[in-house]
């Protein structure tokens, strides 16, 4: 059966300066390939976090993604600013050259409240 990407929250609200968690779970790790988080859709979407590298200031993984059986690809965004508002998508890729997007979560909209 095809892998499913589950983003349980349709939206979250967070005060500027605070942290928020964006939840994402997969139903399978197969086919092998990376998982990435984006803000927005289409050509202009912005890469927010990739589980293949560790250099993303203010964004960290919530679970230990190095567990070989890990299915939790939630992220925490720290020190949220108004510019962080938008809809975030957890996206599963199948390996290739280049990797191919095969499934996206339904998206979680982040609202940033003034402090």
């Amino acid at each position: 059966t095809e892998v499913k990407v589950i983003q349980p929250e349709k939206s979250v609200s967070v005060a500027a300066g605070d942290s928020t968690v964006l939840n994402c779970t997969l139903t399978s790790l197969l086919p092998v390939g990376p998982i990435r988080w984006y803000r927005g859709v289409g050509q202009s979407r912005q890469l927010i976090y990739s589980f293949t590298t560790e250099h993303f200031p203010r964004v960290t993984n919530v679970s230990d993604a190095t567990k070989r059986s890990n299915l939790d690809f939630s992220i925490r965004i720290s020190n949220v600013t108004p510019e962080d508002a938008g809809t975030y998508y957890c996206v599963k890729f199948q390996r290739g050259s280049p990797d191919t997007e095969i499934q996206s979560g339904g998206g979680t909209e982040v609202y940033v409240l003034a402090k």
């Epitope: 790790l29 197969l30 086919p31 092998v32 990376p34 589980f51 293949t52 590298t53 560790e54 230990d64 993604a65 190095t66 567990k67 070989r68 059986s69 390996r95 050259s97």
Partner: antibody, heavy 118, light 107 residues
């Protein structure tokens, strides 16, 4: 620069135990899964065990399950392999290796030689 | 089990291809590891099918398709003489395996 320094090898008798260590530096050790790989004389590479970055999940090849235990101490930037009930077939150079995000290897230790002989 | 040729040879400047078969493209990632002498530390030349570490020369490249992976050395040099092991991680079993190694001789 990433550095992995294996130690703890030596000559032991069959049935005895040995604990190998791997000292890591040059990267955030607590962010990476790690593995042990060995190479018997004149043979190829054989993966033995892996451990998640936090240390809660461990994985073993069947032939060492129950005899070998992989562990880590992130406060000391160190990886360990406890080897019990050693046999002559365990004679090999043992390497620690850092895992990539998809559990392949990008950096290797220099190796430590374990000889099991009566 | 991963299968690779026992040996390959080439003249300096030629292109060498080493294949590794036996994995399942759906569940397996491949890497390539260079060992210049028995018991010396392996060096990763390719991981994640086609990713080259920053300190590895660009003449090394990797690819994967179907049930096989290929290491290509374009413009092989004398210093590339070594044993090359293919390795794989299987996302179904959570297990790593290696091929028996290919001895590259540069004539």
């Amino acid at each position: 620069d990433v550095q992995l320094v294996d130690s703890g090898g030596g000559v032991v008798r069959p049935g005895e135990s040995l604990r190998l260590s791997c000292a890591a530096s040059g990267f955030t050790f607590s962010s990476y899964a790690m593995s042990w790989v060995r190479q018997a004389p004149g043979k190829g590479l054989e993966w033995l065990a892996g451990i998640s970055a936090g240390g809660s999940d461990t994985y073993y090849i069947d032939s060492v399950k129950g005899r070998f235990t992989i562990s880590r101490d992130n406060s000391k930037n160190s990886l360990y392999l406890q080897m019990n009930s050693l046999t002559a077939e365990d004679t090999a150079v043992y390497y620690c290796a850092r895992e990539t995000w998809n559990h392949l290897f990008d950096y290797w230790g220099l190796g430590t030689l374990v000889t099991v002989s009566s | 089990a991963l299968t690779q040729p026992a040996s390959v040879s080439a003249n300096p400047g030629e292109t060498v291809k080493i294949t590794c078969s036996g994995g399942d493209y759906y569940s397996t990632y491949y890497g390539w590891y260079q060992q210049k002498s028995p018991g010396s530390a392996p060096v990763t030349v390719i991981h994640s099918d086609d990713k080259r570490p920053s300190d590895i020369p660009s003449r090394f490249s990797g690819s994967a398709s179907g049930s096989a992976a290929t290491l290509t050395i374009t413009g092989v040099r004398v210093e590339d003489e070594a044993v090359y092991f293919c390795g794989a991680y299987d996302g179904r079993t959570y297990i790593n395996t290696f091929g028996a190694g290919t001895t590259l001789t540069v004539l």
